[in-house]
Interface confidence: medium
């Protein structure tokens, strides 16, 4: 059987768990006595279409309720375990009163008020975080949602929505609470070499040192196998066997658009003629694949002072 819960002296409306998309009438019974629940609105507990309404609920209403959907060829029975709790004396909301947790991120910053669709409610919905009313402009209540601008980990906590259900000219309070957690939303992507450009030619002076930086970005978050490295004539620098040419270990950086990037620097202590004929490949790779930008060196033309 399914479970539903509510708070004493608040409205509670529940649906028959067997209803599916059925349009057939639903009858409700007290499971233990098999006594039928009436449809007259003057009763505190009554049936309305497929819904069972407690207006308001009392602790003694707790128990198992049966609903029967009568269709021409089949009767379907569902059971609902209803528990009405006393209001918690302190601000700490026990787990048994919590609806499902919402996991938010910088892209998902919306909390929906649980079960509100079952009620005849009117805006605005009031929202509380850890029992304090939310009044900062960052928090915006819209229809049944709470929107949070610029979400951070500080926004984690228990959020309670409070609204009124109107029935027969009487207003009833309803409150519902759920937790909100913030996930650092990482993403992974095929590596992008941001520098040097593709097929770049760099000017160097013979006998002088030269350094070429290679930077690549990989997305945001944890990066499995992400690396940036240099090859010379398709051989990794360590195996090339030229002590003058060294690769400086890749260092972590963050790009302007908040992506995780790595940089590796190729250093030549004294450029020789031979170095101009070599091909230098900057490789960036991660689990999605590998990209290569080839760089060539050319002699810097002396400035003509004529």
């Amino acid at each position: 059987s399914k479970s539903s819960w509510g708070l004493e002296n608040e409205a509670l409306i529940v649906r028959c768990p067997q209803r599916g998309r059925s349009t057939y009438p639903v009858e409700w019974y007290y499971s233990d006595t098999n006594e039928s629940i009436p449809t007259q609105k003057r009763n505190r507990i009554f049936v309305s279409r497929d819904r069972l309404k407690f207006l308001p609920a009392r602790v003694e209403d707790s128990g198992i309720y049966a609903c029967v959907i009568r269709s021409p060829n089949l009767n379907k029975t569902g059971y609902l375990n209803v528990t009405i709790h006393k209001k918690p004396p302190s601000c700490n909301i026990p787990d048994y009163l919590m609806y499902s947790t919402v996991r938010g991120s910088d892209k998902n910053f919306k909390i929906t008020c649980p079960t509100i669709d079952l009620y005849n409610w009117t805006a605005p919905v009031q929202w509380f975080k850890n029992c304090k009313a939310l009044q900062e402009p960052r928090f915006r209540a819209h229809r049944s949602y709470l929107f949070i601008d610029n979400v951070t980990h500080d926004d984690e906590g228990d959020y309670t929505c409070q609204f009124t259900h109107a029935e027969n000219g009487t207003n009833y309070i309803v409150t519902a609470t759920r937790s909100f957690t913030v996930e650092e939303k990482g993403f992974s992507m095929f590596p992008v070499i941001t520098n040097p450009p593709y097929n770049h030619t760099m000017e160097v002076e013979i006998g002088k040192p030269a350094s070429i930086a290679c930077s690549a970005c990989f997305g945001k978050g944890s990066h499995f196998l992400a690396d940036v490295l240099w090859q010379i004539n398709k051989t990794v620098v360590g195996n090339f066997g030229e002590a003058r040419i060294q690769e400086e270990e890749g260092r972590n950086e963050s790009s302007s658009n908040d992506m995780d990037c790595l940089t590796s620097v190729l250093r030549i202590t004294g450029v020789t003629e031979k170095d101009l004929s070599l091909e230098y490949d900057c490789l960036a790779l991660n689990l999605h694949g590998m990209i290569r930008h080839t760089i060539r060196l050319r002699r810097k033309q002396p400035i003509d002072h004529r």
């Epitope: 992507m189 690396d227 490789l283 689990l287």
Partner: antibody
Framework: QVQLVQSGAEVKKPGSSVKVSCKAS????????MHWVRQAPGQGLEWMGV????????KYAQKFQGRVTITADESTSTAYMELSSLRSEDTAVYYC?????????WGQGTMVTVSS | EIVMTQSPATLSVSPGERATLSCRAS??????LAWYQQKPGQAPRLLIY???TRASGIPARFSGSGSGTEFTLTISSLQSEDFAVYYC?????????FGQGTKVEIK
């Protein structure tokens, strides 16, 4: 054309090791990753690990950590997968597969039977 | 790890009919999804990568769609050679994981 040719079927005793080879041809061996995937009889595909020849670095699925070693020999364009401490449930067809994330070329598979 | 779930486990289709296979990821894999075909006694063959790009030499009757957590492989008109097992695989995050497979059989 691009192809991966694997070594022949093996029958092994529980507790022993097996080393399967995968010779690549038709492409630049160091430019692509080499994955190993296994398939037990009548079962689905299970990723075991990957080697990046250009780095000489390998990464393994948690399940096989400590029991599998993947290596590559650039000079012969061959990748190897060694699985140790064999048990009967390691009986499977072992495939090497070229590619980065998606595996575009597969070896023909090597049947490894573990039986006492 | 990301769990890939395929449905249905078996699909019975008549030749010439359309087949629709589903694959769901336990969390978003963006478009880093591949589909493979495997026939008895053979190695798998890559059909689709990047969720919707056909691999080299794959007939146009195979198409892939979806992104995030829901993906579909559609075979528009089944030929006799298409009866096989189909696997989806994510390569968005380590470890790479496969679905359990959908067997497409002759009705």
């Amino acid at each position: 054309q691009v192809q991966l040719v694997q070594s022949g079927a093996e029958v092994k005793k529980p507790g022993s090791s097996v080393k399967v080879s995968c010779k690549a041809s038709g492409y630049t061996f160091t430019d692509y990753y080499m994955h190993w995937v296994r398939q037990a009889p009548g079962q689905g595909l299970e990723w075991m690990g990957v080697i990046i020849p250009v780095l000489g670095a390998a990464k393994y699925a948690q399940k096989f950590q400590g029991r599998v070693t993947i290596t590559a020999d650039e000079s012969t364009s061959t990748a190897y997968m060694e699985l140790s401490s064999l048990r009967s449930e390691d009986t499977a067809v072992y495939y090497c597969a070229k590619g980065w994330g998606a595996f575009d070329i597969w070896g023909q598979g090597t049947m490894v039977t573990v039986s006492s | 790890e990301i769990v890939m779930t395929q449905s249905p486990a078996t699909l019975s289709v008549s030749p010439g009919e359309r087949a629709t296979l589903s694959c769901r990821a336990s969390q978003s894999v963006s478009s880093y999804l591949a589909w493979y075909q495997q026939k008895p006694g053979q190695a798998p063959r890559l059909l689709i990568y990047g969720a919707s790009t056909r691999a080299s030499g794959i007939p146009a009757r195979f198409s892939g769609s979806g992104s995030g957590t829901e993906f579909t492989l559609t075979i528009s008109s089944l030929q006799s050679e298409d009866f096989a097992v189909y696997y989806c695989q994510q390569y968005y995050s380590y470890p790479w994981t496969f679905g359990q497979g959908t067997k497409v059989e002759i009705k």
